[in-house]
């Protein structure tokens, strides 16, 4: 069975997997992939380390946290009702059928924020003004300073040069009524 | 043998600031993560924050964001926790340990923190 | 952040007894959950990761299970060195979090 995870449209999805490397630096190979994990390896895959590096990985797909200290979570940038479905972590431990499977279903919600026909408001009191990094482990979020009054035209291309910019990648959990 | 040892405790003045120590031994630090854990007396366990050695990257709980201040000095093997603005609801066990990668497998010692004037 | 409500917050019981304690996440953690235990006056020590992986050295009579959000601590015939607080702690999102402790008493 798997595990539900949630994520709203045009947030980072963060799907959390983590091994104990048997000694440091002793890596083992990890598969992340679109679908149920098979049998064997990982099908559709998104990411795949080795024993040294990440040595596979697709647009917007990236581990989070540092896979050299077991920490293999699943980073999905901008996420779209497109990513819903479920994501296999497979952790390749050598041996017959050793490895440890981990399917994790992501469930994707339409964003929060609705535009509304009257005055429009500032851009901090619409959102909750938190921004991600693209550091290591679960997001971690920064606070702005204040903004001046924006409208949503310029609320979309901000939001796009932060993203394009990589300092940010969502603006989440607004629940905000943009006025 | 895998130990993490903490520096001694410390009686400091409201107000000002202190830096604890663990350094650790039987392992490198730059592999694990190290974190930093409180305990009130006769309270539970909070968590402050961690570092990645290797990179110098912190997380901290919200709670301890600008209180506390997480190092580490990968030449020495020790990490540091830096806390300010001291009042007595800082006095407390603090406990460094490792990680690997998100469950505790070794703890130091602790290091009692009084605050008092 | 996600809540770890630990129950009871304290319990007695005999030598020889099988005990449980609950560790109930506000969130889904799927098994990115530890035990501890922390005897009067000493520090932590692991007991179990991954929500019911022993580890290295913990005695048979400790097991875990659960996931998600639902998780056990069961120790059985009770001995009197399991005299102790006992804390789940979640690892799957900053910040970590413990929770309260159970504290475990012999009659």
């Known amino acids: 069975s798997e595990v539900e995870y949630r994520a709203e449209v045009g947030q980072n999805a963060y799907l959390p997997c983590f091994y104990t490397p048997a000694a440091p630096g002793n890596l083992v190979p990890v598969c992340w992939g679109k679908g149920a994990c098979p049998v064997f390896e990982c099908g559709n895959v998104v990411l795949r380390t080795d024993e040294r590096d990440v040595n596979y990985w697709t647009s917007r797909y990236w581990l989070n946290g540092d896979f050299r200290k077991g920490d293999v979570s699943l980073t999905i940038e901008n996420v779209t009702l497109a990513d819903s479905g479920i994501y296999c972590c497979r952790i390749q431990i050598p041996g017959i059928m050793n490895d440890e499977k981990f399917n994790l279903k992501l469930v994707i919600k339409p964003a929060k924020v609705t535009p509304a026909p009257t005055r429009q408001r500032d851009f901090t009191a619409a959102f909750p003004r938190m921004l991600t990094t693209r550091g290591h482990g679960p997001a971690e979020t920064q606070t702005l300073g204040s903004l001046p009054d924006i409208n949503l035209t310029q609320i979309s291309t901000l939001a796009n040069e932060l993203r394009d910019s990589r300092l940010a990648n969502d603006l989440r959990d607004s629940g905000a009524t943009i006025r | 043998e895998v130990q993490l040892q903490q520096s001694g405790a410390e009686l400091v003045k409201p107000g000002a600031s202190v830096k604890l120590s663990c350094t650790a031994s039987?392992?490198?630090?730059?592999?694990?993560?190290i974190h930093w854990v409180k305990q009130r007396t006769d309270q539970g366990l909070e968590w402050i924050g961690r570092i990645d050695p290797d990179n110098g990257e912190t997380k901290y709980a919200p709670k301890f964001q600008g209180k506390a201040t997480i190092t580490a000095d990968t030449s020495s093997n020790t990490a540091y926790l830096q806390l300010g603005s001291l009042t007595s609801e800082d006095t407390a066990v603090y406990y460094c340990?490792?990680?690997?990668?998100?469950?505790?497998?070794?703890w130091g010692q602790g290091t009692t923190l009084t605050v008092s004037s | 952040d996600i809540q770890m409500n630990q129950s009871p917050s304290s319990l007695s019981a005999s030598l020889g007894d099988t005990i449980t304690i609950t560790c109930h996440a506000s969130?889904?953690?799927?098994?990115?959950l530890s035990w501890y235990q922390q005897k009067p006056g000493n520090i932590p020590k692991l007991l179990i990761y991954?929500?019911?992986n022993l580890h290295t050295g913990v005695p048979s009579r400790f097991s875990g299970s659960g996931s998600v959000t639902g998780f056990t601590l069961t120790i059985s015939s009770l001995q009197p060195e399991d005299i102790a607080t006992y804390y789940c702690q979640q690892g799957q999102n900053f910040p970590y979090t413990f929770g309260g402790g159970t504290k475990l008493e012999i009659i």
């Open positions: 039987g392992f490198n630090i730059k592999d694990y993560y």
């Open positions: 969130q889904n953690i799927n098994v990115w």
């Open positions: 340990a490792r990680s690997s990668p998100y469950y505790f497998d070794y």
């Open positions: 991954k929500a019911s």
